[in-house]
């Protein structure tokens, strides 16, 4: 058998083919699907197979991250002759089969999207009756989740020599630009840290030395919106403590 990737420009599908003179498997998935956090998304997946009129037991599987070995997020099974694919697994109850596997459609709906859902997903179908065969998408579909900025943490922390620093962490996709404003600051980008590995949607900005008392505001902005949060610094003059 040969597996190839054919990019069909007219419908932007990845078509994966598994063929020999007598049989042919193929799976069609788009390279990417985009949706906003909080909304729902549909991951399309259709397939063709060489087992004409197959009516035996089948399983439909969707997994995340990597093909063949990634964690399953959805699985359903249909009994012989049945068009009902009974859900056996739906991670956090947010995954639902839209397509009918008996009609070669494994399309999946993902509800209440979160930034953590921004991954690659792989569909798989398994036959297990008189016919024993299965096929899985190798390239998968990238679910791109966008989100307006949200400030997840803002704080003032002690620094050496009785100084203070401020940290602001925000999430969003595209990753938001952060800016600090405050006493004697104007508007400052202030030591923005790039998204950390494993936390690709989080961005942190630090104000390394707060020199004046008052209100410090962190603003996060991307193409979908902006968000801001403030922290107050008040030092007891003549003492080493501070109130924030």
């Amino acid at each position: 058998f040969v597996r190839t990737k054919i990019d069909t420009t007219e419908n932007l599908l990845n078509t994966e083919v598994h063929s020999s003179p007598a049989q042919r498997w193929s799976m069609q998935v788009p390279p990417e699907v985009s949706a906003e956090a909080g909304d729902a998304a549909v991951l399309p997946c259709t397939f063709t197979h060489p087992h004409r009129h197959y009516d035996g037991p089948l399983t439909a599987i969707w997994r995340a991250g990597e093909p063949y070995a990634g964690p399953q997020v959805f699985r359903c099974a249909a009994a012989r002759g049945s068009e009902l694919c009974q859900t056996a697994l739906s991670l956090h109850g947010r995954f639902r089969l839209l397509g009918n596997p008996r009609r070669n459609d494994l399309s999946l709906r993902v509800e209440r999207l979160a930034l953590a859902d921004d991954r690659r997903y792989f569909c798989r179908v398994e036959f297990a009756g008189d016919v024993h065969d299965r096929y899985e998408s190798r390239h998968g579909v990238r679910l791109h989740v966008t989100a307006a900025p949200r400030i997840v943490n803002i704080s003032v922390l002690p620094s050496p020599a009785h100084a203070f620093r401020a940290l602001c962490t925000a999430e969003g996709e595209p990753p938001p630009a952060l800016a600090w404003s405050g006493p004697a600051l104007g508007n400052s980008l202030a030591a923005v840290r790039s998204p950390r590995e494993g936390h690709g949607h989080l961005v942190t900005a630090e104000l390394p030395a707060l020199t004046h008392d008052g209100r410090y505001t962190c603003t996060a902005a991307n193409s979908l919106g902006r968000s801001e949060a403030s922290v107050y610094l008040f030092r007891f003059h003549g003492a080493s403590g501070a109130s924030t």
Epitope: T59, Y68, A69, R75, E126, A128, R134
Partner: antibody
Amino acid sequence: EVQLLESGGGLVQPGGSLRLSCAASGFTFSSYAMSWVRQAPGKGLEWVSTITGGGESTYYADSVKGRFTISRDNSKNTLYLQMNSLRAEDTAVYYCAKAIGSSWYSDAFDLWGQGTMVTVSS
Amino acid sequence: DIQMTQSPSSVSASVGDRVTITCRASQDISSWLAWYQQKPGKAPKLLIYVASYIHSGVPSRFSGSGSGTDFTLTISSLQPEDFATYYCQQSYSIPYTFGQGTKLEIK
């Protein structure tokens, strides 16, 4: 910790019976097909049997068909192999193994137990 | 049943060498092939699945290729811990079958 732990091996006479167990932990047991693979002393690996995640289907090597029965108790995260009418050629280390990414198919065995020795001798 | 034939049955090599082990199936098995490493007294460990996917935690010096009937496992630069026996296994159809093994020894 993700692991498989076999037990139940031992010395048995030809024609006798033995029941092997494999306790699984650290993963969702019912989501994966499970198998038994054996290895005779100084020999290679031989697939023995597979059971689907929900226990709907079982498969056997011809050499054990009708004598061995694979089963699972998903509430106890345990896989079993009931071996009857044992023969000298069944002498081997028996491993339980987890399928990599499917409840119906074993694309590969990504997790193995440490093995339990079964000796069939008079 | 599908027969799996590995070659060579044994190979001697030195640390740093590049080693290739081949596995041939008696019929077309698409890409449904896995490779395992086994050391004496230990359980096998999965190295490669679906012909070319490296299992998590396996060093990148291991790679797999092939489809249809002919497959290879390559170790790009042998390390001391790589001396072991290697098995291929087809998962295309039941009964699942293994190759007879290739013993990799220190030269």
